[in-house]
Interface confidence: medium
């Protein structure tokens, strides 16, 4: 229903704490370079204004849209052009073009230093002195680095952060308590960030219909006892919520997400038998719990999918009369029977089914033509199954770091033009799929692996789109979202690439590497590995193993030496010479 004052309506629905958090996230995602202090000042001004509108919805400016109010605030920032360049041009536009312009200027790879976690004692002190400010900084730092992070979910992670600090800061060994718990929150949040970016990419590039198809498949897997109309109601709501968040309408998005959770909990009987535990939780935890809910049990007596979609004499008539309903029902029926498939695979099968009907229903004997369609799914199903098998076997053999290196070599060979930092980031993330998915039961591996890889490859596409350098990457990224992962998997060594000159400074290291944390050490080594492959794209696995082994020994030896600097200075050139020789 329409409200006199949109901002008052959202403030009342969300409550002051969540309202302020969401406004802070919105501003941090739009203006990623502004310091926390500047954003928090704006947040307070917006909150005070919202309160005046709650008191009197007819007060001046209370009838303005939230985009107008937020945009006016952002455009009033002094020195906007100095700090943001052409983003300031957005301010000359009217809504809704102004908001669209802000969205287009979101930077997926902002030039910000990696978020450094303070030392445990210092962290606890600042948390205990001012928890609100501490958590505000967390929201700001995550949101500006991840401008598409799903805002209500980020509030949930801030709540988790709060819980961990509240618990651990009273312990005698604060670091021992904090480190593993905060690492776990960070890991989950980073995965959430790439998953949400994929959803926004889907929405931006392919529109609501494509996103709704994704949601239908996902909901059907989770809630196989819900009927199709229920599934499409949920899918429609989830599509609207994601569209709002991807579009910067964070208050509406969070409000609608809470509404959906309420609806699901009020209609458990027609959705799933697994919801009750989630429904007893407070709002942020409830929504998060529902988003992560385990699959309900598949009904025991489901008939063969062939009955309605292959054997029925009326297949072409049904398809012609109501294409969307017929294909939607096919996707629903197939997905509810296959929680063991990835959503990407289910969408590929639905696409194959549609293409088959398009072709066959125009022919003389349609049933003879589409009669084998389910058998034709087999190769499409086998391809990702083999991918999972071979990659999980490799992961089990090499461990996470070794597996990341294998992926890094593979992807540098596929797209050597891509910048080394981007390749290293992508390979490290792709390599984590082993730890994340390969330890799961067989039935959960495929959906875990493929849907995670798709999200990571989407990040690669988003970064590559900013500065396109590889035709092969552009080709895979331009196609349909569900075909991306198979497209990347099918890429081979880029034969058009002219190998990079061998630069000694790329492989010159200093004693500062010795004091780096393990993760940073790994990144240094992986950077060297990518550069090696760029120099010798056709180097064999054994050659690369030799050089990298040599390199690891060199670092280890010099870091143990009494005069580290001297060791690096003298042994370094020897290493470079040996490496060149080994790769000749």
């Amino acid at each position: 229903e329409a409200h006199k004052s949109e901002i008052a309506h959202r403030f009342k629905d969300l409550g002051e704490q969540h309202f302020k958090g969401l406004v802070l996230i919105a501003f941090s995602q739009y203006l990623q370079k502004c310091p926390y202090e500047e954003h928090i000042k704006l947040v307070q001004e917006v909150t005070d204004f919202a309160k005046t509108c709650v008191a009197d919805e007819n007060a001046e400016n209370c009838d303005k849209s939230i985009h107008t109010l937020f945009g006016d605030k952002l455009c009033a920032i002094p020195k906007l052009r100095d700090n943001y360049g052409e983003l300031a041009d957005c301010c000359a536009k009217q809504e809704p073009e102004r908001n669209e312009c802000f969205l287009q200027h979101k930077d997926d790879n902002p030039n910000l230093p990696p978020f450094q976690r303070p030392e445990a004692e210092a962290m606890c002190t600042s948390f205990q002195e001012n928890p609100t400010s501490f958590l505000g900084h967390y929201l700001h730092e995550v949101a500006r680095r991840h401008p598409y992070f799903y805002a209500p979910e980020l509030l949930y992670y801030a709540e988790k952060y709060n819980e961990v600090l509240t618990q651990c800061c009273t312990e005698s060994d604060k670091a021992a308590c904090l480190t593993p718990k905060l690492d776990a929150v960070k890991e989950k949040a980073l995965v959430a960030a790439v998953r949400q970016r994929m959803k926004c990419s889907s929405m931006q590039r392919f529109g609501e219909r494509a996103f709704k198809a994704w949601a239908v498949a996902r909901m059907s897997q989770r809630f196989p006892n819900a009927e199709f109309a229920e599934i499409t109601k949920l899918a429609t709501d989830v599509t609207k919520i994601n569209k709002e968040c991807c579009h910067g309408d964070l208050l509406e998005c969070a409000d609608d997400r809470a509404e959906l959770a309420k609806y699901m909990c009020e209609n458990q009987a027609t959705i799933s038998s697994k919801l009750q535990a989630c429904c007893d939780k407070p709002v942020l935890q409830k929504s998060q719990c529902l988003a992560e809910i385990e699959h309900d049990n598949i009904p025991a007596d489901l008939p063969s999918i062939a009955a309605d979609f292959v054997e029925d004499k009326e297949v072409c008539k049904n398809y012609a009369e109501a294409k969307d309903v017929f294909l939607g029902t096919f996707l629903y029926e197939y997905s509810r029977r296959h929680p063991d498939y990835s959503v990407s695979l289910l969408l590929r099968l639905a696409k194959k089914y549609e293409a088959t009907l398009e072709k066959c229903c125009a022919e003389g004997d349609p049933p003879a033509c589409y009669g084998t369609v389910l058998a034709e799914f087999q190769p499409l199903v086998e391809e990702p199954k083999n991918l999972v098998k071979t990659n999980c076997e490799l992961y089990e053999k090499l461990g996470e770091y070794g597996f990341q290196n294998a992926v890094l070599v593979r992807y540098t060979q596929k797209a050597p033009q891509v910048s080394t930092p981007t390749l290293v980031e992508a390979a490290r993330n792709l390599g984590r799929v082993g730890t994340k998915c390969c330890t799961l039961p067989e039935a959960q591996r495929l959906p875990c692996v493929e849907d995670y890889l798709s999200a990571i490859l989407n990040r690669l596409c988003v970064l590559h789109e900013k500065t396109p350098v590889s035709e092969k990457v552009t080709k895979c990224c331009s196609g349909s979202l569900v075909e991306r992962r198979p497209c990347f998997s099918a890429l081979t060594v880029d034969e058009t690439y002219v190998p990079k000159e061998f630069k000694a400074e790329t492989f010159t290291f200093h004693s500062d590497i010795c004091t780096l944390p393990d993760k940073e050490k790994q990144i240094k080594k992986q950077t060297a590995l990518a550069e090696l492959v760029k120099h010798k794209p056709k180097a064999t696995e054994d050659q690369l193993k030799t050089v990298m082994g040599d390199f690891a020994q060199f670092v280890d030896k010099c870091c143990k030496a009494a005069d580290k600097d001297n060791c690096f200075a003298t042994e370094g050139p020897n290493l470079v010479a040996r490496s060149k020789e080994a790769l000749a």
């Epitope: 006892n225 009927e227 199709f228 109309a229 599934i231 499409t232 109601k233 429609t236 027609t270 009904p299 008939p303 009955a307 309605d308 979609f309 029925d312 009326e314 049904n318 109501a322 969307d324 309903v325 017929f326 939607g328 029902t329 096919f330 629903y332 029926e333």
Partner: nanobody, 116 residues
Amino acid sequence: QVQLVESGGGLVQPGGSLRLSCAGPGFLLRSNTMGWYRQAPGKERELVAFIRPSGLTNYNDAVQGRFTISRDNAKNTVYLQMNSLRAEDTAVYYCHTRPPFQRDSWGQGTLVTVSS
């Protein structure tokens, strides 16, 4: 638009029985809630009964215990068995579903007249 076709209406004496049938595409009948509605002359259309894909049924209080809704997936048909009919059951009976992404689908209706 999806086609639903009702049959089985007619003239029957009070206390008598009739069985209405609604035929439609199998994929639709199996995956969606199917309902029977009725509209008596000069009155609003009202829900008589519905059946979910799971087999769960629901009835209007006025027909509870006298009418039974069922489905036969093999025949792609939904039935409404009407027993102990009364004069106030006289109406045009419509089969209905609401497939997602589409407007409601209604049949053309079948007339049931209860009179002595």
